[in-house]
């Protein structure tokens, strides 16, 4: 019961695997917590120990590595299930130790059921394809290390529930699925089923990912400010509410940070004394182009406020834009009674 460096439950690595399929799970210690790998640890005399806590239990127990057909085994820093069962769900701990050193981390493993159309509670990775961009491929993910290179598995691809055969612009090519020209109609869930033999048994690996067709970098432009513009003048009397929308369109750009902000007389609204509020809303098109609107609001505008410069700014990886709102003070209409009196020569 000597002290052990406990990294706790690593919920960042919520591992989900399908029921009745092989699963290989690497001990996260070497990937994310320690500065050395398993080989180094092993040659330094450290031992890797696995144990688990069943779902809805508090009791840590050793993993049974003596199951029929070696259903659960360990190989170096990998825990193998051949295959998984539903009640394998729980928190798994790998501990690296010797007489003077100890480090451990736990992680949740969820064994998930799927239906005949591959629907399940599994969180699906998203792969983005550029619209009308030429040939693009997706690859059946997370199948490395399950079988040696000498084994030639069979791979079947599905879109939703349907086996991909004779599709117009989607062609299965072994582990890859090629999209000749991606269109919005290609959005959906794609599943590869990898079937391979091992020790006289046949195993299946099912991998589903979501394909999302997004705007192409060929069509990407700097942000476009729709409002404010040259056609709208914000003409207000002191005491009225001033509302100016800054509406900006952003082309989809992979990993681009889209920013919108207001300046008033060259300063951020937070840095000035006037009582201004800004509300933001965001909407997306089917190809993930983005429209951001920031509405600048001054409840009771003063004549000084109506002389200020209100500028909407926007920036993406493609460039920066800015547009000043046309703000002016409304000239009060002449009072009719006074005009009339003067007109009649009243004194």
């Amino acid at each position: 019961s000597e002290r052990c460096d406990d990294w706790g439950l690593d919920t960042m690595r919520q591992i989900q695997v399908f029921e009745d399929e092989p699963a290989r799970i690497k001990c996260p210690l070497f990937e994310h917590f320690l500065k050395f790998n398993y080989s180094t640890a092993h040659s330094a005399g450290l031992t890797l120990i696995w144990y688990w806590t069943r779902q809805d239990r508090d009791l840590e127990e050793p993993i049974n590595f003596r199951l029929p057909e070696n259903r659960i085994s360990k190989e170096k820093d990998v825990l193998w299930f051949r295959p998984t069962l539903l009640n394998d769900t729980g928190n798994y701990t790998c501990m690296l130790r010797n007489t003077t050193y100890c480090s451990k981390v736990a992680f949740p493993l969820e064994v998930v059921q799927k239906d005949s159309c591959f629907n399940s509670p599994m969180k699906l990775p998203v792969h983005k394809l550029y619209i009308e961009y030429g040939i693009q491929r997706i690859t059946c993910p997370n199948v490395d290390g399950y079988f040696p290179s000498s084994v030639k598995p069979t791979i079947t691809w599905y879109m939703g529930c349907y086996k991909i055969q004779n599709f117009n612009n989607v062609i299965p090519e072994g582990m890859n699925l090629s999209f000749l020209i991606a269109l919005i109609s290609n959005n959906g869930n794609y599943t590869c089923v990898v079937t391979y033999p091992e020790n006289g048994r046949t195993f299946h690996l099912t991998r589903t990912l979501t394909v999302k067709v997004v705007g192409s970098p060929k069509n990407a432009v700097p942000p476009v400010i729709h409002s404010p513009n040259d056609h709208v003048v914000y003409e207000k009397e002191p005491g009225e509410e001033l509302l100016i929308p800054c509406t900006v369109y952003f082309s989809f750009l992979m990993d681009s940070r889209n920013e919108v902000w207001w300046t008033i007389d060259g300063k951020k609204p937070d840095d000035i004394t006037i009582d201004v509020t800004i509300n933001e809303s965001i909407s997306h098109s089917r190809t993930e182009d983005e429209t951001r609107t920031q509405i600048l609001s001054i409840k009771k505008v003063t004549s000084e406020d109506l002389k200020r410069s209100y500028v909407c700014h926007a920036r993406s990886a493609k460039g920066e834009v800015a547009k000043a709102a046309k703000v002016k003070q409304k000239v009060p209409a002449p009072r009719y009674t006074v005009e009339l009196a003067c007109g009649f020569g009243a004194t």
Partner: antibody, heavy 117, light 112 residues
Framework: SLEESGGRLVTPGTPLTLTCTVS????????MGWVRQAPGKGLEYIGI??????TYYASWAKGRFTISKTSSTTVDLKMTSPTTEDTATYFC??????????????WGQGTLVTVSS | DIVMTQTPASVSAPVGGTVTINCQAS??????LAWYQQKPGQPPKLLIS???TLESGVPSRFKGSGSGTEFTLTISDLESADAATYYC??????????????FGGGTEVVVK
Amino acid sequence: SLEESGGRLVTPGTPLTLTCTVSGIDLSSYAMGWVRQAPGKGLEYIGIISNSGTTYYASWAKGRFTISKTSSTTVDLKMTSPTTEDTATYFCARDRYANTHGIFSLWGQGTLVTVSS
Amino acid sequence: DIVMTQTPASVSAPVGGTVTINCQASESIYSDLAWYQQKPGQPPKLLISFVATLESGVPSRFKGSGSGTEFTLTISDLESADAATYYCQCTYGGSGSGNGAAFGGGTEVVVK
């Protein structure tokens, strides 16, 4: 950076093309403009080309000048029929923004055009 | 066409003093105004855009104000390095209106 070239002595009526060569600037992300300055005089705006290639000119410059993007790194100013009044240093300038204002935050050193018979 | 009129044509003030340059537009340009500094033999340098937005690296001694048709550039705590010609500019370059990015005639600032 921006560098103008093509300035020289020409006779009135002889077309002349000035070139602005940019480096480290993506012309699809900025508007580019041309401004001139006659010797000892003030700045005079000629026109601007947007990041997408739309051109805008000062009223006096329409028909006398043509701005175009000739490659991903060059913007040209064509003087269709120069007169002696067109003698000036011609500056190429980059807009501060992608949308077209004429807020010129980066300038070349200028190229001198002398129109004389 | 928009015409920008700058006054005075020349102004002189001592080191540490303040100068004010005025710029008038022939029609309302709202907040679309920039100020530039130009020294002999050099290209202009952008100081201020959108009436009051200081370019990065420009000292806060430079202050732009105004709206509509009347604009002012104030330079306080004058330094000898501020001696230059200053231009205002309407920045309607892409509006399609004639002379949308017209410059004023310039104001020469002499620092004594």
